[in-house]
């Protein structure tokens, strides 16, 4: 039969609120060398127990009886500390455990989760979370909006999750946790109502260096929009934008628009260039989220200057004309050059030279054309750039007016009519 237990004092019970500090104590009387006292919680040895052991001899001899006291200190009581506690000793070849003591938690509800501050778009549904526990259970929750209860009594309304169908003004939310011991109130969460994301961002008109864009504002609750911000970024290297990244790969061009109207002219852009644009609108509460990036492109323009360094030389019945690309911006893809030449009393001849930068003109007959001049213009898909100033060809045989023909086989009439002011006709009879 089992030997008599050496324990003469068993752990007591502790019940209290979170954060409480308490001590469990057990005492035993043994003969001979005092054993080490271990503590069990729910059958498991506590390896990192905050325990102290005191040993007092009851006689002069080491083999006499000893009183051993072990104290287990529980600091800042938590739910994980609750359970059944026992002392355990190994004496010789026998194991002894004390009678159990119990550690319980009982107090005001304790929040595991509280509502968090957040921003929401006006009139947009969202959820808030609140979770509390005892013991004692049950714990009933009561939600409050702007300090006003959202249910008639704790436990009657929404519990862990509050669904808010939408707000039109910045509001505060908190939750109360009720149990048999009383009430705990959570932190107060501020829900800031921002404008909704603008919709339908689109192009109204396009110019080579400017885009006019418009959008539809979203709802902003009781707070009027103060302004909208438009961002544009070059998208030729904007792989990040294509991939849906939230931030552009380079510093965007940012413009502010007073509202209304919900429209903005973006200037100082590069012609014939792809951009991505987005817009966000701001109220006194803060900015909306950005719209998705919208790909747009400025159209081509006409070249801003004439071809450079035009030289026209004559050798007998031939005239050789060459030039260089305009130094001024082309505003698009250069498609070619047009050349116009004219004598004093002869009709103007227009030629499309293509992308070549030189041409030889056959001046038929042996007479010279007086005051022969040549003009050159570059063109893109958008049209002609400005014509160069007339470059004169000196008469080869003065007084001989021969008809002028072109050596190249381009049609002598223009492919489409030219605005008259592009031509530089300063010839006099």
């Amino acid at each position: 039969q089992a030997e008599e237990s050496p324990f003469v004092g068993n752990p007591g019970n502790i019940t209290g609120a979170r954060g409480l500090t308490g001590t469990l104590r057990c005492q035993l009387q043994v003969q001979g060398e005092p054993p080490e006292v271990h503590w069990l919680r729910d059958g498991q040895i506590l390896e990192l127990a905050d325990s102290t052991q005191t040993q007092v001899p009851l006689g002069e001899d080491e083999q006499d009886d000893w009183i051993v006291v072990s104290q287990l200190r529980i600091t800042s009581l938590q739910l994980s500390d609750t359970g059944q506690y026992q002392c355990l000793v190994f004496l010789g070849h026998q194991t002894f455990v004390s009678q159990p003591g119990y550690v319980g938690l009982e107090g005001l509800p304790y929040f595991l989760e509280e509502p968090e501050d957040r921003t929401v778009a006006a009139n947009t549904p969202f959820n808030l979370s609140c979770q509390a526990q005892g013991p004692p259970e049950p714990v009933d929750l009561l939600w409050l909006q702007d300090a006003v209860p959202l249910a008639t009594a704790p436990g009657h309304g929404p519990q862990r999750s509050l669904h808010v169908p939408g707000l039109n003004k910045t509001s505060s939310f908190s939750c109360e946790a009720h149990n048999a011991k009383g009430v705990t109130t959570s932190r107060t969460a501020t829900i800031t109502v921002l404008p909704q994301q603008p919709r339908n961002l689109h192009l109204v008109s396009r110019q080579p260096t400017e885009l006019e864009v418009a959008w539809t504002p979203g709802l902003s609750g009781i707070y009027p929009l103060t302004h909208c911000t438009l961002q544009a970024v070059l998208s030729d290297d904007g792989m990040g934008i294509q991939a849906g990244e939230p931030d552009p790969p380079e510093e965007p061009l940012t413009s502010q628009a007073s509202v209304p109207p919900h429209q903005l002219r973006l200037g100082s852009l590069h012609p014939h260039t792809p951009y991505h644009i987005r817009v966000a609108c701001t109220s006194s509460q803060g900015p909306s989220s950005w719209t998705h990036w919208l790909p747009v492109e400025t159209p081509e323009g006409v070249p801003l200057g004439p071809p450079e360094n035009i030289s026209a030389t004559r050798n007998g019945s031939q005239a050789f004309v060459h030039w260089q690309e305009p130094r001024a911006p082309l505003q698009g893809t250069l498609l070619g050059y047009r050349l116009a030449y004219q004598g004093q009393d002869t009709p103007e001849v227009l030629m499309d030279i293509g992308l070549r930068q030189e041409v030889t003109l056959e001046l038929q007959g042996d007479g010279s054309v007086s005051n022969l001049t040549v003009c050159v213009a570059a063109y893109t898909a958008a049209g002609d750039g400005p014509w160069s100033l007339p470059v004169p060809l000196e008469a080869w045989r003065p007084g001989q007016a021969q008809p002028v023909h072109q050596l190249v086989k381009e049609p002598s009439t223009p492919a489409f009519s030219w605005p008259h002011h592009h031509h530089h006709h300063h010839h006099h009879h």
């Epitope: 089992a2 237990s5 271990h38 059958g43 040895i45 455990v97 159990p100």
Partner: antibody
Framework: QVQLVQSGAEVKKPGASVKVSCKAS????????INWVRQAPGQGLEWMGW????????KYNEKFKGRVTMTRDTSISTAYMELSRLRSDDTAVYYC?????????WGQGTLVTVSS | EIVLTQSPDFQSVTPKEKVTITCSAS?????MYWYQQKPDQSPKSLIY???NLASGVPSRFSGSGSGTDYTLTINSLEAEDAATYYC?????????FGQGTKLEIK
């Protein structure tokens, strides 16, 4: 001396329940935890849970929650383990073991065979 | 849960040899326990609190270790030591066992 004596082998059909007993002697039954550990054929050891006979408190391995129930009868120093909704992979030897922070004494084991 | 991995899974040794079985824990633990199980028998406690011999266990058995690495040593192996040896932890719930090391005597 400490002894744990278990009930005999059982053969059960899938979906049935089995109840194994463990009679303790040689120590104060209500002071020590009784654990249940199982061992499938040719396999290792798997802890199922414990009961504290003094109070009847139990703690189960999450794997068996909802299927295992541990009880005791202090008048006859006997602990019981019932496993329900048996499946073929519940075929194993089921041991009771006294614990003092570890398993210091073990029953002889009860073979439970689940077969249709 | 804490996973215990024993090494080796199987060992064939001659009597009088020294045998070392290791047990590695997936997280740090405070104490290790060791059990011996002979064929068709229930497990028997061998070592408790890492290094203490259970009642009736011969002194040729010893245990050591800390943190994640623990060792069971059998000095001068005897024929009756042929068995499967299991390590076990209860530093965190649930208590878990190693997969076992089978010791065969040549």
């Amino acid at each position: 001396q400490v002894q744990l004596v278990q009930s005999g082998a059982e053969v059960k059909k899938p979906g049935a329940s089995v109840k194994v007993s463990c009679k303790a002697s040689g120590y104060p039954f209500t002071d020590f935890y009784i654990n249940w550990v199982r061992q499938a054929p040719g396999q290792g050891l798997e802890w199922m849970g414990w009961i504290y006979p003094g109070s009847g408190n139990t703690k189960y391995n999450e794997k068996f929650k909802g299927r295992v129930t541990m009880t005791r009868d202090t008048s006859i120093s006997t602990a019981y383990m019932e496993l329900s909704r048996l499946r073929s992979d519940d075929t194993a030897v089921y041991y009771c073991a006294r614990s003092t922070g570890f398993f210091d004494y073990w029953g002889q084991g009860t073979l439970v065979t689940v077969s249709s | 849960e804490i996973v215990l991995t024993q090494s080796p899974d199987f060992q064939s040794v001659t009597p009088k040899e020294k045998v070392t079985i290791t047990c590695s824990a997936s997280s740090s633990i405070g104490y290790m326990y060791w059990y011996q199980q002979k064929p068709d028998q229930s497990p028997k406690s061998l070592i408790y609190l890492t290094s203490n011999l259970a009642s009736g266990v011969p002194s040729r058995f010893s245990g050591s270790g800390s943190g994640t690495d623990y060792t069971l040593t059998i000095n001068s192996l005897e024929a009756e030591d042929a068995a499967t040896y299991y390590c076990q932890q209860w530093s965190s719930n649930p208590p878990t066992f190693g997969q076992g090391t089978k010791l065969e005597i040549k």
